[in-house]
């Protein structure tokens, strides 16, 4: 379950990204094909949904923030790809405050979709507890929607 006990550092700025080396047999960095990206998205979807549903159950009545926009898709590629560079520090930051098991699995998948040497920009979340909860909810909702969008693009005909 997600909870938030005070200010932490999170990431929002999203950069174009792809994959990391896993082994000597794996394709070099940024070179995973759409088929493998689709596999990773399929792994991420239930993790993201579960995290969001748990948070919504725990934090009932928290509204979505209208000041947070997760620009999670690349605009310079077809099909659009997931930008993970700024999502990663967000999940790294909430890890101590959340379900570490789920967060670790999400981080593991996002790492595979990240440029090897891409910097991870950090931003401050609102200090106000209620605004923090709203910020987290918005990120989780938009992340889930982003995954759905990428998955649909990978399913819609030739890559």
């Amino acid at each position: 379950m997600l909870s938030h006990t005070g200010p932490s550092r999170f990431a929002l700025f999203l950069l174009c990204s792809m994959e990391t080396l896993l082994s000597s047999h794996m394709a070099p960095t940024h070179q995973l094909p759409p088929s493998d990206v689709r596999k990773i998205i399929l792994e991420l979807q239930p993790l993201s949904r579960g995290l969001l549903e748990d948070y919504q159950k725990k934090e009932t009545g928290v509204p979505e923030s209208n000041r947070t926009l997760l620009l999670c898709l690349t605009s310079d590629s077809q099909p659009p790809r997931l930008n993970s560079s700024a999502i990663l520090p967000y999940f790294r930051a909430i890890r101590p405050l959340s379900d570490k098991n789920i967060i670790d699995k999400i981080i593991e998948q996002l790492d595979k979709l990240k440029f090897q040497h891409e910097p991870e920009t950090e931003i401050s979340v609102p200090a106000d507890t209620f605004e923090c909860k709203s910020f987290i909810l918005t990120i989780l909702q938009q992340f889930s929607a982003c995954l759905e969008s990428v998955f649909k693009s990978l399913n819609s005909g030739p890559q």
């Epitope: 792809m18 994959e19 896993l22 082994s23 047999h25 794996m26 394709a27 070099p28 940024h30 070179q31 995973l32 094909p33 759409p34 088929s35 493998d36 689709r38 596999k39 990773i40 399929l42 792994e43 239930p46 699995k105 595979k112 990978l154 030739p158 890559q159």
Partner: antibody
Framework: EVQLQESGPSLVKPSQTLSLTCSVT????????WNWIRKFPGNKLEYMGY???????DYNPSLKSRISITRDTSKNQYYLQLNSVTTEDTATYYC????????????WGQGTSVTVSS | DIVLTQSPASLAVSLGQRATISCRAS??????????MHWYQQKSGQSPKLLIY???NLESGIPARFGGSGSRTDFTLTIDPVEADDVATYYC?????????FGGGTKLEIK
């Protein structure tokens, strides 16, 4: 060394369900992607689908309405079920491992021949 | 689906000579300069065996007589020199896009 072994009935009647088991040794099915492929009598190979290390499945759209891949991690086995079979499903069925992103299917079972006939 | 067309369907080569098998994809299987095309050998009564991954990388334990080349839509498997043990059917396979697909196979025989 990684080894895969298919097992199941060699004869299935039309409209029935084809059920096969892939037993894996030398690796855990809780890592990598575990696939089913079949080879028709005319030598054509068809990719059927996979079950992932986490239990996520994905299927060839041409089979989606009939196929199910499941697993039993305690036995290190995964399974293929193909419903409503016809004579067109007569083939040799292989299980195979896809171990790393960007790589290829590096370990295959020896295959099991299945005939669909009444 | 990406269609892979192999040619020739069968090939007879003298021992010690070169065998060349072609695989053409209906669309590019490249991303960021990597080609997601692989080659398998299947001997009679056996399962497919990985020879070449990502167009040109020799799988561990495979003799250097086997080689792969090509990019985008056109790929080649070369066996030089051919040995008696190479009698088999050879398949190309793409893992660029779902569903993964295979070529129709090329049967290699000794002349």
């Amino acid at each position: 060394e990684v080894q895969l072994q298919e097992s199941g009935p060699s004869l299935v009647k039309p409209s029935q369900t084809l059920s096969l088991t892939c037993s894996v040794t030398g690796d855990s099915i809780t890592s990598g992607y575990w696939n089913w492929i079949r080879k028709f009598p005319g030598n054509k190979l068809e990719y059927m689908g996979y079950i992932s290390y986490s239990g996520i499945t994905d299927y060839n759209p041409s089979l989606k309405s009939r196929i199910s891949i499941t697993r039993d991690t305690s036995k290190n086995q995964y399974y293929l079920q193909l419903n409503s079979v016809t004579t067109e499903d007569t083939a040799t069925y292989y299980c195979a491992r896809y171990g790393n992103y960007g790589y290829a299917m590096d370990y295959w079972g020896q295959g099991t021949s299945v005939t669909v006939s009444s | 689906d990406i269609v892979l067309t192999q040619s020739p369907a069968s090939l007879a080569v003298s021992l010690g000579q070169r065998a060349t098998i072609s695989c053409r994809a209906s669309e590019s299987v490249d991303t960021y300069g990597n080609s997601f095309m692989h080659w398998y050998q299947q001997k009679s009564g056996q399962s497919p065996k990985l020879l070449i991954y990502r167009a040109s990388n020799l799988e561990s334990g495979i003799p250097a007589r086997f080689g792969g080349s090509g990019s985008r839509t056109d790929f080649t498997l070369t066996i030089d020199p051919v040995e008696a043990d190479d009698v088999a059917t050879y398949y190309c396979q793409q893992s660029y896009e779902d569903p993964w697909t295979f070529g129709g196979g090329t049967k290699l025989e000794i002349k």
